[in-house]
Interface confidence: low
């Protein structure tokens, strides 16, 4: 073992270094002192450190550690924060488009219903937005309210337009009859199934991203213990007390110290891994009725089909309701001409064709791939921080917390540290309360994510599948079938391209009335949106 270098006779180097940490030199000895009052940098001989300097070093060491931790998590934090914002905005855009598609359908096909229909549709999609953001709204109630509100208007405006004003107090009866008589057939139930499943998954997806931000924020702002501060001080600053200004800590020693300091944080690792894998499972399942983009953008077609269903049964229905709601029919229902095909106005559905299309789905998968590169983030933190702070390469000629050594030996270092500080003790103390809380939150979200993504027949799908709601797929082409069956059906090719509302914002007020019946070609809407470089750091 090489002899310790002679101490700086004047503590000059130490004074100039410490001056940068703490203006004023009153705490720095002018010449080496015995240092018997030191508690961390226990001297083997004369030292250039005082107790006050030690305290300042500890404070600085903890601050350094906090900064290193924050810079370590910066990229991950940015990734999740930006994607949470991006997806929240994207979902809002999808909801807005879905509302406008639905309003356009009413304006083009049922202009006599529009004032009230717009109001009900607006309320429904407002509730959809609130639900996605976590509001305690029941999806079935939302759908029921939409159809409960629509039916009296459909009945009084379309089916029995000659009702006198005195008979218009039957609205409450009509709302009740709507369910009793299943006037819309199974369409409300179909919509409930699709909307509740897709929104539930969307909501948990956003919740999970927001919790991801909370996890990073929590670990980002951890206050390290005094014990950790002492270890860091010994590693980073105690060499200065011996005048060893250029010596770097041994890499192996740094890892031991970091593992001690990070013992609590590293406990998050298991749940963080599970979080990313559970989120991936959820994302992999977000298609068809588990994809809100697919479901909401097809709602206008399903609602259109449901109204056609009412119209097809209007004769019998009018008689039944006449008795049920105790009002006399003013005139027989005359089946007006309601075209089977949906009018789609090109102005309402302006399209931006883009070569590199990007769907919400592909964006989700891209996020998961990026998140998976951070799957070992917490277990790798000690090593990451050591690699981003000054350490000696190959563990040669380095500082082991007590002295300059030619080669670092973990066993020797630990034996030498026993009197000063027990690393094992630090690890056994367990995580900070804030870490325990965030672990509990991760456990909870992982539980929810697992519940959402049961691969072999999700628990509550069984009966619904048996009722045939998901039968009748559109075949093997790329297009996803949306809405019910029949002539009113529409294909939305490759789904909405989201985020940058480049070419249009649907404005129903600008949409002309019933111009002309759409051709089959018009019915194949390609709604392409490009992400562009609006959020360039993620591109």
């Amino acid at each position: 073992q090489p002899p310790p270098p002679p101490p700086d006779a004047t503590c000059h180097q130490v004074r100039s270094f410490f001056q940068r940490l703490q203006p004023g030199l009153k705490w720095v000895p002018e010449t080496p002192v015995p240092g018997s009052d030191l508690q961390v940098c226990l001297p083997k001989g004369p030292t250039c450190c005082s107790r006050k300097m030690e305290e300042k070093y500890q404070l600085t060491a903890r601050l350094n550690m906090e900064q290193l931790l924050q810079s370590a998590s910066m990229e991950l934090k940015f990734l999740i924060i930006q994607n949470a914002a991006v997806f929240q905005e994207a979902f809002e855009i999808v909801v807005r488009h879905a509302k406008n598609y639905t309003n356009a359908m009413f304006k083009n096909n049922y202009p006599s219903l529009t004032p009230q229909a717009f109001e009900f549709v607006g309320e429904f999609f407002t509730d959809v937005s609130l639900y996605i953001l976590g509001s305690d709204i029941n999806v079935d109630d939302m759908v029921n309210e939409l159809f409960d509100s629509l039916f009296p208007v459909i009945y009084t405006q379309l089916m029995n337009p000659g009702l006198p004003d005195s008979a218009l107090d039957i609205n409450e009866c009509l709302r009740g009859a709507r369910r009793d008589l299943k006037v819309f057939g199974n369409f409300p139930k179909l919509i409930m199934t699709q909307v509740s499943k897709s929104l539930q998954v969307t909501r948990i997806f956003l919740q999970a991203l927001n919790l991801g931000i909370e996890v990073i924020n929590t670990t980002d702002h951890l206050k390290f213990s005094k014990d950790c501060g002492r270890m860091l001080t010994r590693m980073w600053y105690c060499s200065y007390c011996q005048g060893l200004m250029m010596v770097k800590p041994c890499g192996g020693y740094c890892n031991v110290v970091m593992q001690g300091c990070m013992a609590g944080v590293v406990e998050i690792d298991k749940y963080w891994r599970e979080y990313i894998l559970s989120l991936e499972e959820l994302v992999n399942g977000m298609y068809r009725i588990y994809d809100m983009e697919n479901v909401l953008l097809g709602l206008f077609s399903t609602i259109h089909d449901s109204i056609q269903y009412v119209q097809k049964n209007a004769g019998k229905l009018t008689t039944t309701i006449g008795k049920l709601c105790a009002h006399s029919q003013q005139r027989q229902y005359r089946s007006a001409y309601y075209p089977e095909d949906l009018f789609i106005d090109k102005k309402v559905l302006k399209v931006a064709h883009v070569e590199h299309e990007e769907t919400l789905s592909s964006r989700r998968r891209e996020l998961i791939q990026k998140l998976k590169s951070f799957i070992s983030f917490y277990s790798a933190l000690p090593g990451y921080i050591c690699s981003h702070s000054p350490v000696a390469e190959n563990d040669t000629l380095c500082w082991n917390g007590q002295e300059l050594v030619e080669r670092y030996s973990q066993k020797a270092a630990r034996n030498g540290m026993k009197n000063q500080f027990n690393l094992h003790e630090l690890k056994m103390k367990g995580p900070e309360p804030v870490v325990s809380q965030i672990i509990d939150k991760l456990k909870h979200i992982n539980q929810l994510l697992r519940t959402m993504s049961m691969p072999k027949g999700r628990v509550l799908d069984k009966n619904l599948d048996e009722e045939g709601f998901e039968s009748g797929d559109c075949g093997d082409d790329e297009d996803e079938c949306i809405g019910g069956s029949g002539d009113g059906m529409i294909k939305v090719k490759n789904q909405l391209r989201f985020l940058a509302e480049l070419a249009y914002d649907l404005d129903v007020d600008d949409a002309p009335g019933n111009s002309q019946q759409a051709t089959p070609k018009d019915n194949e809407i390609s709604t392409f949106h490009n992400l562009g470089n609006v959020h360039s750091p993620l591109k």
Epitope: D136, M192, L460
Partner: antibody, heavy 117, light 108 residues
Framework: QVQLVQSGAEVKKPGASVKVSCKAS????????MHWVRQAPGQGLEWMGI????????SYAQKFQGRVTMTRDTSTSTVYMELSSLRSEDTAVYYC??????????WGQGTLVTVSS | QPVLTQPPSVSVAPGKTARITCGGN??????VHWYQQKPGQAPVLVIY???DRPSGIPERFSGSNSGNTATLTISRVEAGDEADYYC???????????FGTGTKVTVL
Amino acid sequence: QVQLVQSGAEVKKPGASVKVSCKASGYTFTSYYMHWVRQAPGQGLEWMGIINPSGGSTSYAQKFQGRVTMTRDTSTSTVYMELSSLRSEDTAVYYCARWHGGPYDYWGQGTLVTVSS
Amino acid sequence: QPVLTQPPSVSVAPGKTARITCGGNNIGSKSVHWYQQKPGQAPVLVIYYDSDRPSGIPERFSGSNSGNTATLTISRVEAGDEADYYCQVWDSSSDHYVFGTGTKVTVL
């Protein structure tokens, strides 16, 4: 505090039906799924099925398919389990249990159903 | 429907450790929950997700799960621990919750 209060004991004849209720309080009824579990005298626990009080959708154990019906009344925060075509081997204590995607954190006190001619 | 096998009974002296096993094919890949049931009472959750303990459950109760066996361990057994214990898993192949056969713990 969370409570699940079940209806009282029932004695039924073979071939009859029984409807057991489970009234929930102390939490948002529609936020938690409810399961039904039964236990024959001196026997183990047996899972019967699940109901989502929010939408009313259900999933039943294969063994009880066609004989069991689970329903809910959100206005009274009550779930019901009806078992038809009763036989003597259906004599058991029937429990409702609150579920949130994992373990059962709260159970009802149990309802003894005796099937005897 | 897969069977979760538990020993019918386990006897243990006060202050000693009781271990209750729950055997099932590749049970380590599933989350296991454990319930305690005293005579005439509803079951009570004692361990969930293999090893987590609900608030109010003493630290003496712990769980582990790997391979084909999950284990509930009760250390420093007390007279009040005398009860039936059941393990439970979600079986994805049948979309059923499955309970173990149950173990009666007797404190000598």
